[in-house]
């Protein structure tokens, strides 16, 4: 059957932990992505930011997992209003910020 939302979120959190702890060199060669507002619709916005990073195997699983939380198809070059379009940050910082926010969502029972 389908994976419960709580399990899916926990698995996403654990994948982000793995990414942050396995950094030997700069994540995705120091690629920059648009910062996002960590609010409703945040999963799609996060995917829209990360999907523009190509050739980075470290975040491919994260991209796939985020797509499971986003109700519509996301493709490169697509942007929502949730992006802070004047602020770009390194993928590593983006992942750390997203991880902390997801841990708080998990605590609050916001699994979707």
């Amino acid at each position: 059957g389908p994976v419960p939302p709580s399990t899916a979120l926990r698995e996403l959190i654990e994948e982000l932990v793995n990414i942050t702890q396995n950094q030997k060199a700069p994540l995705c060669n120091g690629s920059m992505v648009w910062s996002i507002n960590l609010t409703a619709g945040m999963y799609c916005a996060a995917l829209e930011s990360l999907i523009n990073v190509s050739g980075c195997s470290a975040i491919e699983k994260t991209q796939r997992m985020l797509s499971g939380f986003c109700p519509h198809k996301v493709s490169a070059g697509q942007f929502s209003s949730l992006h802070v379009r004047d602020t770009k940050i390194e993928v590593a910082q983006f992942v750390k910020d997203l991880l902390l926010h997801l841990k708080k969502l998990f605590r609050e029972g916001q699994f979707n």
């Epitope: 926990r10 932990v17 702890q21 841990k103 609050e108 029972g109 916001q110």
Partner: antibody, heavy 122, light 108 residues
Framework: QMQLVESGGGVVQPGRSLRLSCAAS????????MHWVRQAPGKGLEWVGV????????HYADSVKGRFTITRDNSKNTLNLQMNSLRAEDTAVYYC???????????????WGQGTMVTVSS | SYILTQPPSVSVAPGQTARITCGGN??????VHWYQQKPGQAPVLVIY???DRPSRIPERFSGSNIGNTATLTIERVEEGDEADYYC???????????FGGGTKLTVL
């Protein structure tokens, strides 16, 4: 100001019972999860258990499960810890602690009482 | 049940930086809180949610949480920082709150 005041500590024989109380003031008691934490002399902190804001759920440390019961009376802003079948290893300072309530009780303990000493000895 | 491992003691000279670690399996997936306890007193929250600081706590205190290790960092250590420090997480698999064993910070 916001305050938690424990009472009911003392010396008790092994196998006997004791009831601790905690009076809360200065904040909206019914909106907080409430925990008990204990500290044996010269030892570290040990979580005892939690009761949710509305009293609907309790969780206990394995070391006290089946012997200790946490209750609360939101109309009187009081938290209780009923301790039965006490053992020497239950000797400790017992702290009443509050934590904001979410779906999980994973919030930090932002207010502590001064603690009350429980000594289990024959 | 979930286990948090802290070094029993850390020593540092005044003005230097103290780092107190808290190890746990994939602790980075959990929200970590830190408490300071001075002799004869109740613990005080110094860091919550990995890296947030209560308003009354000096900026010298900071926290991080990556992989299997959370770290409490105290910069420009003062004699008044000498205390026991405890990390804490909620283990959602057992519905238990868990404390580390505590670390005694000694200011030389």
């Amino acid at each position: 100001q916001m305050q938690l005041v424990e009472s009911g500590g003392g010396v008790v024989q092994p196998g006997r019972s004791l009831r601790l109380s905690c009076a809360a003031s200065g904040f909206e008691f019914r909106t907080y999860g409430m925990h008990w934490v204990r500290q044996a002399p010269g030892k570290g902190l040990e979580w005892v258990g939690v009761i949710w804001d509305d009293g609907s759920n309790t969780h206990y440390a394995d070391s006290v499960k089946g012997r200790f019961t946490i209750t609360r009376d939101n109309s009187k802003n009081t938290l209780n810890l009923q301790m039965n079948s006490l053992r020497a290893e239950d000797t400790a300072v017992y702290y009443c602690v509050r934590a904001p309530q979410w779906y999980l009780t994973a919030e930090a303990f932002d207010l502590w009482g001064q603690g009350t000493m429980v000594t289990v000895s024959s | 049940s979930y286990i948090l491992t802290q070094p029993p003691s850390v020593s540092v000279a005044p003005g230097q930086t103290a780092r107190i670690t808290c190890g746990g399996n994939l602790i980075g997936a959990k929200l970590v809180h830190w408490y300071q306890q001075k002799p004869g007193q109740a613990p005080v929250l110094v860091i919550y949610d990995d890296s947030d600081r209560p308003s009354r706590i000096p900026e010298r205190f900071s926290g991080s949480n990556i992989g299997n290790t959370a770290t409490l960092t105290i910069e420009r250590v003062e004699e008044g920082d000498e205390a026991d420090y405890y990390c804490q997480v909620w283990d959602y698999s057992s519905d238990h709150m868990v404390f580390g064993g505590g670390t005694k910070l000694t200011v030389l």
